[in-house]
């Protein structure tokens, strides 16, 4: 299709080489089409446009994204060629930063249902650069935490070093929806609730004598509870003896509950205590089996291919640790009688 009629938008993504960050492009179709399509800024019944150019499906995923190769080759379907770019409804998510993401991205409806729809497309020219200026060493992170029940703020990473007075007008989005009341480089939250969690995007316009472009940053905000003051507790095994059948395989599971910690480095290991020696056992990786706001339950198994008499002469010890302290639970195997 002819992309010369597409509306054009220029965006700049300046990424930090120190941290992992994501980026998004919204399918910003011209206002009337967008309102019928991507369910953003929906028109009220009184705001009917003179014509309804795109009367396509209301399915939010019915847009098609392409990349325009710089060598003039035909447009490429994003989904087929770029595994690090994911389409979610009308939004394109870039999972990894890098200058190789620079280029022109085009979005348009999948279903063309009226003559007006032919020009219903947006071309976004994305420039991606690594952050070079070290003038702002403490720029806000692309991952920010808000403590539930307290006051907090979300800062726009690309503007966090500027004072509110210097800051240009900022457009904020949360999970793809425009936050029309927010215009400063910082969103202040009077009381944090779990619904404040999400993907926030902050945009502001930068210009030079030739052109203007949108500088965009993406912030992943999570709502958290305060760090635990407790060491982890072992939920299983509960008993310190376990009846087993000799010659049979055996799996002993260790399940431990770890309270929330902002910097979370849980340890869960199995040791064998053989008389007065102890050594760590090579066992399958630990896995998280339940995660809530307040805590996480992690499980790690020890597998014996065949229980022998030797195993009845030693203890199997599960050791768990967080930044507060550690807990152990030992299991003594006992032969099943009869």
């Amino acid at each position: 299709f002819n992309i010369s009629g597409c509306s054009t938008k220029k965006l700049l993504w300046t990424y930090s080489t120190r941290s992992e960050e994501e980026f998004v492009l919204f399918c910003d179709l011209p206002e009337p089409q967008k309102s019928h399509f991507c369910h953003r800024n929906r028109l009220s019944p009184k705001q009917v446009p003179e014509h309804l150019p795109f009367m396509g499906s209301n399915d939010l995923s019915d847009v098609q994204w392409y990349q325009q190769p710089s060598n003039g080759d035909p447009l490429e379907d994003i989904r087929k060629s770029y595994p690090h770019i994911i389409q979610d409804k009308c939004t394109l998510h870039f999972l990894t930063p890098g200058v190789n993401n620079s280029g022109s991205y085009i979005c348009r409806p999948k279903m063309i249902k009226s003559p007006y729809d032919v020009a219903c497309c947006v071309k976004m020219i994305l420039e991606v650069k690594p952050q070079t200026n070290a003038s702002c060493e403490y720029s806000a992170s692309h991952k920010q935490d808000l403590l539930l029940g307290s006051t907090g703020s979300i800062s726009c990473p690309s503007l966090s070093c500027q004072s509110d007075a210097q800051s240009p007008a900022v457009t904020w989005y949360k999970n793809g929806k425009l936050l029309s009341v927010e215009r400063s480089n910082r969103i202040v939250v009077d009381e944090v609730y779990d619904y404040h969690q999400g993907t926030y995007v902050c945009d502001y316009t930068q210009s030079d004598t030739v052109s203007s472009w949108t500088v965009r940053a993406v912030v992943q905000v999570r709502t958290i509870v305060g760090d635990t003051k407790l060491k982890p507790d072992i939920l299983d095994p509960v008993e310190d003896t376990l009846e087993v059948e000799l010659g049979k395989p055996l799996t002993i599971s260790c399940k431990a509950r770890f309270g929330f910690e902002r910097v979370f480095n849980p340890v869960i290991k199995w040791y064998i205590k053989d008389s007065d020696l102890e050594w760590e056992v090579s066992v399958p990786e630990a896995k998280s089996i339940k995660s809530t706001l307040k805590d996480e339950i992690i499980e790690r198994n020890i597998i014996l291919e065949k229980v022998t008499q030797r195993d009845l002469r030693r203890k199997f010890v599960c050791f768990v640790q967080n930044s507060i302290g550690n807990t152990t639970q030992s299991v003594q195997l006992k032969e099943k009688r009869g």
């Epitope: 007065d276 022998t308 008499q309 030797r310 002469r313």
Partner: antibody, heavy 111, light 113 residues
């Protein structure tokens, strides 16, 4: 630490009981307490072990029948020996496998 | 019953040199690496040097190194000191089925020149 006692000079055919006393720890956390002997100028020979959690015993095949290992308290283990012969002359060590050994007690079987 | 065969005695080593002692088991030890090494000096009880084939016991100099798995094991002493003159024993752990729980090797005497 561990200390053996009961070593003596006895006649062939006699019986003898050796005692091993632990200090500074007890057996509750589970140890293999063993008796090991060493004839003069010879190597180490494991006789028997008892796992102190469940009193599970193990004997070297040659020691079955004449030797009996027992846990008599939370800090003592004994070795009863019967029908002693000159071949049983040795220093008998009590060991908490693997790190802790007593100094040994000498048993001499001679007429 | 399991048999552990050690390098014939005595083995001589020069101060500052390296000496290796081998220990061969008639069957694989438990968990392929449950073998320990002891040092015994005249008139003293044995002292644990290495366990799990290669793990140094606390307080033992790093000049002592254990290696091997299954049925074949080696104790290597590098930068040999006069104090290393002793008899060295390997102790194998087995599955405790049919009387086989532990076995000592016959011992290897190391003479330091």
């Amino acid at each position: 630490s561990l200390e053996e006692s009961g070593g003596d000079l006895v006649k062939p055919g006699a019986s003898l009981t050796l005692t091993c006393t632990a200090s500074g720890f007890d057996f509750s956390s589970g140890y293999d307490m063993c008796w090991v002997r060493q004839a003069p100028g010879k190597g180490l020979e494991l006789i028997a072990c008892i796992y102190t959690v469940n009193d599970n015993t193990w004997y070297a095949s040659w020691a079955k029948g004449r030797f009996t290992i027992s846990k008599t308290s939370s800090t003592t283990v004994t070795l009863q020996m019967t029908s002693l012969t000159a071949a049983d002359t040795a220093t008998y060590f009590c060991a908490r496998l693997y790190k802790l050994w007593g100094p040994g007690t000498l048993v001499t079987v001679s007429s | 019953a399991q048999v552990l065969t050690q390098t014939p005695s005595p083995v001589s080593a020069a101060v500052g040199g390296t000496v290796s002692i081998s220990c061969q088991s008639s069957q694989s030890v438990y968990g392929v690496n449950e073998l320990s090494w002891y040092q015994q000096k005249a008139g003293q009880p044995p002292k644990l040097l290495i366990y799990k084939a290669a793990t140094l016991a606390s307080g033992v100099p790093s000049r002592f190194k254990g290696s091997g798995s299954g049925t074949q094991f080696t104790l290597t002493i590098s930068d040999v000191q006069c104090d290393d003159a002793a008899t060295y024993y390997c102790l194998g752990n087995y599955d405790c089925e049919s009387d086989d729980c532990y076995a000592f090797g016959g011992g290897t005497e190391v003479v330091v020149k």
